[in-house]
């Protein structure tokens, strides 16, 4: 039985489609292609005589069609108006003609989408971020990618407006990364350039690492005291120290050579992030003994958290 296959079935606007004829009868002497589901002289695209290899355009010929000796019809630079049915009539030597109908669908060529954001530097646990994929295209599927992966399942991620809008409710630091949107129709797909989400967070409660030089289990007079403060924060926090409430340097490491009992007291590391508007601190009590063993860092270290 004569059949028509469209390759591809879904065609992007501006591309080409080939209508392939299968199971052609042996005694064929010519072909005619028509636009539509039936044979109608007004809808004739092109006729072809096998013996002379002569193609004759009809009233529906647009100049973009090419007929081949095997009855296939190539349509180039397709438009959405080309969507629909096409009928091949095979003329046989016994004048009992055969007909078959095929179809294809033309979809608009998709533009490269772009992402707009209401906030590309949100603050953790405070801000929501809405990404919008533009432009709006009818009959199109919108997809989102985060760091090259499909969207994770999370109650904080909401899709709306036909998936055109991705909202992150109460952003977290691990939401940071590269966001892309992709628009798809059955014929083609196009992906946006990535947009980077920079989540501002912290400073978290700092930690103080004591490094004694030479290494020892206790703070003995004459040792070097190296206190290193660290706090997770974006941007990196500003560090500052206070000893017994008196402001010291603005470095991450506090170094005191050859400590003595005069260095006893509270050592506080303060961290500040102007971008989040948040501060934090930790206080440790240090005891230095003149000789023998000492308690070193007190177990009663405590921290302060400010917003």
């Amino acid at each position: 039985k004569l059949t028509i296959e469209s390759t591809p079935f879904n065609v992007a606007e501006g591309k080409e489609v080939l209508l392939l004829a299968h199971n052609l009868p042996q005694n064929r002497i010519g072909y005619s292609w028509y636009k539509g589901e039936r044979v109608d002289g007004n809808s004739l695209i092109v006729g072809y005589v096998i013996g002379t290899q002569q193609a004759t355009p009809g009233p529906a010929y647009s100049g973009r069609e090419t007929i081949y000796p095997n009855a296939s019809l190539l349509i180039q630079n397709v438009t959405q108006n080309d969507t629909g049915f096409y009928t091949l009539q095979v003329i046989k030597s016994d004048l009992v003609n055969e007909e078959a109908t095929g179809q294809f669908h033309v979809y608009p060529e998709l533009p490269k989408p772009s992402i707009s954001s209401n906030n590309s530097n949100p603050v953790e646990d405070k801000d929501a971020v809405a990404f919008t994929c533009e432009p709006e295209v009818q009959n199109t599927t919108y997809l989102w990618w985060v760091n090259g992966q499909s969207l994770p399942v999370s109650p904080r991620l909401q899709l709306s407006n036909g998936n055109m809008t991705l909202t992150l409710l109460s952003v977290k630091r691990n939401d940071a990364g590269s966001y892309e949107c992709e628009i798809q129709n059955p014929a083609s797909a196009n992906r946006s350039d990535p947009v980077t989400l920079n989540v501002l967070y912290g400073p978290d409660v700092p930690t103080i690492s004591p490094i004694i030089s030479p290494p020892d289990s206790s703070y003995l007079s004459g040792a070097n005291l190296n206190l290193s403060c660290h706090s997770a924060s974006n941007p990196s926090p500003q560090y500052s120290w206070r000893i017994n409430g008196i402001p010291q340097q603005h470095t991450q490491v506090l170094f005191i050579a050859k400590i003595t009992p005069n260095n006893n007291g509270t050592y506080a590391c303060f961290v500040s992030n102007l971008a989040t508007g948040r501060n934090n601190s930790i206080v440790k009590s240090i005891t230095v003994s003149a000789s023998g063993t000492s308690p070193g860092l007190s177990a009663g270290a405590h921290h302060h958290h400010h917003h």
Partner: antibody
């Protein structure tokens, strides 16, 4: 007291290189990052880059990438800034400056400056 | 890179006048802004950091304000020793960039 003492003035020909030194004293050298800033005659201040004396990590302004190299010698508490492929527009006073603290702080102590003149 | 734009480029005022210099960042720098004073033939001197924190030893007639993208340096009562060029600089990560400078003169 904190001091940054730079090497003396230099006159160089176009295409040559210059290496300026900056010796730090009066504080723990490895605790503070050191930056280089230049100022062309009658012009404003231009940031070149910085070095972390503790690790040797450097970060340079895009404009100077490939032409500038910053190094340090912890044994002498000295940092160096070498600028290659000199051109006349590199004529400027070059300053080393200490960052006030670690991370996102400005520059609190400055060297006296080194005048580099590039002329054929 | 973040661009810093200062205005005016120069000003002339009388002793005792209140003087205001503005600095605008091309993007949000939160409060990470510093002001420097550079007297003729001298090295720059840090006056203010974090937009409003006065460095120890700097006269209290100097003050800073602003956040986000718009910042101001104010000299409440101009003194003869304040004749200098003033620069703003963001310290919100590198690359650091400076404003083009404001030259302050006495009438």
């Amino acid at each position: 007291q904190v001091q940054l003492v730079q090497s003396g003035a230099e006159v160089k020909k176009p295409g040559a290189s210059v290496k300026v030194s900056c010796k730090a004293s009066g504080y723990i050298f490895t605790s503070y990052w050191l930056h280089w800033v230049r100022q062309a005659p009658g012009q404003g201040l231009e940031w070149i880059g910085y070095i972390n004396p503790q690790t040797g990590y450097t970060s340079y302004a895009q404009k100077f990438q490939g032409r500038v190299t910053m190094t340090r010698d912890t044994s002498t508490s000295t940092v160096y800034m070498e600028l290659s492929s000199l051109r006349s527009e590199d004529t400027a006073v070059y300053y080393c400056a200490r960052e006030y603290g670690n991370y996102n702080y400005p520059l609190d102590y400055w060297g006296q400056g080194t005048l580099v003149t590039v002329s054929s | 890179d973040i661009q810093m734009t200062q205005s005016p480029s120069s000003l002339s005022a009388s002793v005792g006048d209140r003087v205001t210099i503005t600095c605008r960042a091309s993007e949000n720098i939160y409060g990470y802004l510093a002001w420097y004073q550079q007297k003729p033939g001298k090295v720059p001197k840090l006056l203010i950091y974090n937009a409003k924190n006065l460095v120890e030893g700097v006269p209290s007639r100097f003050s800073g304000s602003g956040s986000g993208t718009d910042f101001t340096l104010t000299i409440s009562s101009l003194q003869p020793e304040d004749v200098a060029t003033y620069y703003c600089q963001h310290h919100y990560g590198t690359p650091y960039t400076f404003g083009q400078g404001t030259k302050v003169e006495i009438k």
